[in-house]
């Protein structure tokens, strides 16, 4: 074409895939009449007529652009809809009058790639490989033109480095004309790279300027030989019997070696392998003092069959042994003295305390409790508590019952019971003493005895209320080899005038109706008489 060599550079029009490109014919009025223009696409030096404008009216030529072209701006602009990558070419408009002139437009098409997808090499990388190994693959799909990839490690871009870093990129063209980029990062890694964060970045251009997209960060499994194995105990700090203790092996290699935990047998000094759970953890639950000792861990690399041994670790499970009190079942005469001695073993310094069981009162701080001039009230429970002050919750206790020889001691001397004639009455009588007393009743009825504790007995009697019984009352007699004692239960007939709600004189009332032989329980609601009780 004459004068083609001097043609100016084409006008650049940039547009994203899928949008509409506005191709404005830049011919001036002197160069041609815009109401008579032909539009061409130029592909590989070949022009193809795609649109005609005659008297301001446009007409598409048959072909690939037939459905996507329209005239705008009173015929000066050709609109190309649904732009695809294949539309990246030169378009030219040619005016026919007064003389043939043309105006060239370079259409540039862009499409942002999808978010880059990064896949780490699942097999991992050994640190002692001779050449760079595949670390990760980055894929950027459906971009146009081909985006640029930059690999980063710990936020720093990676450069090609002979025998150290190699980036291998390739691309494929999809049927849509878009590009899918695949980049493989190969590198020689060192042990310190086990925590390194790798990611890839795609750089691409849009009409609006330069952009980039980053992948997620990944770490790659790095395999390196174990140099050291060690033991870790949880919980940290002082351990005590009853705790849940976990002993685990750790190693600085990846993959970790095959672990075994052994404990030194104190008598043979031999290491004996312990049974661990599926995770290789030795769980001591509950921990016992026998678990104390020297533990060590062996790590065996199954590839090289190299075995490493940890530093031994002393485990101390603190304990307090069973507490022993002597004498264990003391029996003493009234007025005598008694020394109670408490003993226990522990892995730590022990503190002893003596408490009165019935009241919780602390009687003595120390292992020896001395009781002088014993009264029968001194009989009963004494508890020795052996504890390790430095380890909260580590303590053992032992209860000792002190028996004071003496005749039976009645819970009450006299008691009044409200009754109705012909009712079956349930009476109870309690006595204590050492030796433990037995209880008898002065009336016929069904009696049963219950031992409350080694020195105390409770007897219950079911008896029918008769006029004779009302007259005599009921006596219970407690006896042992040292003597006897009696309690008297006075029976009083209930009448409506005595039934005042807060009567201080009623000590018991059956709520049963007074039909003959109705069974009732007079003791379930008994209250003691207001006068002081005798301890006979």
């Amino acid at each position: 074409v004459p004068g083609e060599a001097e043609q100016p550079a084409p006008e650049l029009v940039e547009v994203e895939v899928g949008s509409t490109a506005l191709l404005k014919c830049g011919l001036s009025q002197s160069q041609g009449n815009l109401s008579h223009v032909d539009w061409f696409s130029v592909h590989k030096e070949k022009r193809t007529l795609i649109f005609r404008v005659r008297q301001g009216q446009g007409q598409s030529e048959p072909g690939e652009y037939e459905q996507r072209l329209s005239l705008q701006d009173r015929g000066a602009t050709l609109a190309l809809t649904q732009v695809t990558p294949q539309d990246e070419r030169i378009f030219l408009c040619q005016g026919k009058r007064p003389r043939s002139q043309e105006y060239r437009i370079q259409l540039r098409v862009y499409k942002a790639p999808e978010e880059p997808n990064i896949q780490v090499n699942p097999l991992g990388i050994p640190v002692n490989s001779k050449e760079p190994e595949e670390v990760a693959t980055c894929v950027g799909r459906n971009g146009y033109p081909i985006p640029q990839v930059i690999w980063y490690k710990n936020g720093r871009p990676l450069k090609e480095e002979k025998n150290r870093v190699h980036i291998q990129s390739s691309q494929t063209v999809e049927s849509s004309g878009l590009y899918t980029l695949q980049s493989i990062l190969k590198a020689q890694l060192v042990k310190e790279d086990k925590d390194a964060q790798f990611y890839c970045e795609l750089n691409y251009r849009l009409p609006s300027g330069n952009h980039m997209k980053e992948s997620r960060e990944v770490t790659v499994p790095v395999f390196y030989p174990t140099e050291k194995v060690w033991l870790e105990v949880e919980p940290v700090g002082m351990l005590k019997e009853g705790d849940r203790v976990e002993i685990r092996c750790l190693a600085d290699g990846n993959p970790p070696p095959h672990f075994s935990i052994s404990k030194q047998n104190p008598s043979t000094r031999e290491a004996e392998e312990e049974t661990t759970n599926d995770n290789g953890v030795l769980v001591l639950e509950p921990a016992r003092k026998e678990h104390s000792g020297r533990y060590e861990c062996q790590g065996l690399d199954l590839d090289t069959m190299i075995s490493l041994l940890s530093e031994p670790q002393e485990l101390l499970v603190n304990y307090v042994s069973d507490v022993r009190v002597s004498p264990a079942a003391p029996e003493r005469q009234e007025g005598s003295s008694l020394t109670l001695t408490c003993e226990a073993e522990s892995s730590q310094d022990l503190e002893f305390q003596w408490l009165r069981e019935e009241t919780g009162q602390v009687l003595e701080r120390g292992p020896v409790l001395q009781l002088h001039d014993l009264k029968r009230e001194a009989g009963g429970g004494y508890r020795c508590v052996a504890s390790v002050p430095s380890i909260p919750g580590l303590n053992r206790t032992q209860l000792v019952n002190v028996a004071i020889f003496g005749p039976p001691w009645m819970a009450f001397k006299e008691r009044k019971v409200w009754v109705k004639e012909n009712m079956v009455l349930n009476l109870s009588c309690e006595a204590s003493g050492h030796p433990r007393p037995t209880i008898s009743w002065n009336v016929n009825g069904t009696a049963s005895e219950q031992d409350q504790d080694p020195q105390r007995v409770l007897s219950t009697l079911n008896v029918l209320v008769t006029p004779e019984l009302l007259e005599t009352g009921v006596e219970c007699t407690a006896s042992n080899d040292l003597g006897k004692n009696t309690s008297i239960l006075f029976l009083e007939l209930v009448n409506l005038t005595t039934l005042t709600p807060d009567s201080n004189t009623t000590t018991g009332l059956s709520t049963s109706t007074a039909s003959p032989h109705t069974r009732a329980n007079s003791t379930s609601t008994e209250r003691k008489l207001p006068e002081p009780e005798s301890r006979g």
Epitope: A328, P435, R436, D451, P454, D481, L482, G483
Partner: antibody
Framework: QVQLVESGGGVVQPGRSLRLSCAAS????????IHWVRQAPGKGLEWVAR????????YYNEKFKGRFTISRDKSKNTLYLQMNSLRAEDTAVYYC???????????WGAGTMVTVSS | DIVMTQSPSSLSASVGDRVTITCRAS??????????MHWYQQKPGKAPKLLIY???NLESGVPSRFSGSGSGTDFTLTISSLQPEDFATYYC?????????FGQGTKLEIK
């Protein structure tokens, strides 16, 4: 030291009587219970009776009630077992033993042999 | 009467062995935490000797290799490591009620 010493054993004809003694020393006699326990040759132990010297209260194994009597002489710290109407099956070593109020026997005498034979 | 049944009646063991003798009462001999069960050792021609009182308490002067346990009706005497002087006959006894009764005895012999 605490000691119980039995005496009075020997050979006796069936139907006759025998009195065994148990001398206590080294402890307050009236503060403990004294028991008689017997053991037939090659057999096990059998509790016979008990006394509390402080109050003279006695208990017997029903098997021996009526034939055997337990007693004491407080002034001599001595306990007795009077055995009447003796039978061949009463042949045994007779031990006296001490207890507290939980009735376990913490001190025993060496025993005295009684043989009932015609 | 409460019947006391000991097992085994006889037992052969060696020095250093751990030995357990059991005693079963025909009814409970325990009262609120106290078990009225006692163990004795008797050697030929000698009086019985108290080993364990109230089920688990070691009598003063008795070696700690002897121990007792149990409650209710079932009780055991354990010798943790037999010594030559332990070969003897062992008896259990209850004192829960009258009459006090003994087990028939367990004869411990040298194997």
């Amino acid at each position: 030291q605490v000691q119980l010493v039995e005496s009075g054993g020997g050979v006796v004809q069936p139907g006759r009587s025998l009195r065994l003694s148990c001398a206590a020393s080294g402890f307050t006699f009236s503060n403990y219970w004294i028991h008689w326990v017997r053991q037939a040759p090659g057999k096990g132990l059998e509790w016979v009776a008990r006394i509390y010297p402080g109050t003279d209260i006695t208990y017997y194994n029903e098997k021996f009630k009526g034939r055997f009597t337990i007693s004491r002489d407080k002034s001599k710290n001595t306990l007795y077992l009077q055995m009447n109407s003796l039978r061949a099956e009463d042949t045994a070593v007779y031990y006296c033993a001490r207890s507290g109020g939980y009735w376990y026997f913490d001190v025993w005498g060496a025993g005295t042999m009684v043989t009932v034979s015609s | 009467d409460i019947v006391m049944t000991q097992s085994p009646s006889s037992l052969s063991a060696s020095v250093g062995d751990r030995v357990t003798i059991t005693c079963r009462a025909s009814k409970s001999v325990s009262i609120s935490g106290y078990s009225y069960m006692h163990w004795y050792q008797q050697k030929p021609g000698k009086a019985p000797k108290l080993l364990i009182y109230l089920a688990s308490n070691l009598e003063s002067g008795v070696p700690s290799r002897f121990s007792g346990s149990g409650s209710g009706t079932d009780f055991t005497l354990t010798i943790s490591s037999l010594q030559p002087e332990d070969f003897a006959t062992y008896y259990c006894q209850h004192s829960r009620e009258l009459p006090y009764t003994f087990g028939q005895g367990t004869k411990l012999e040298i194997k």
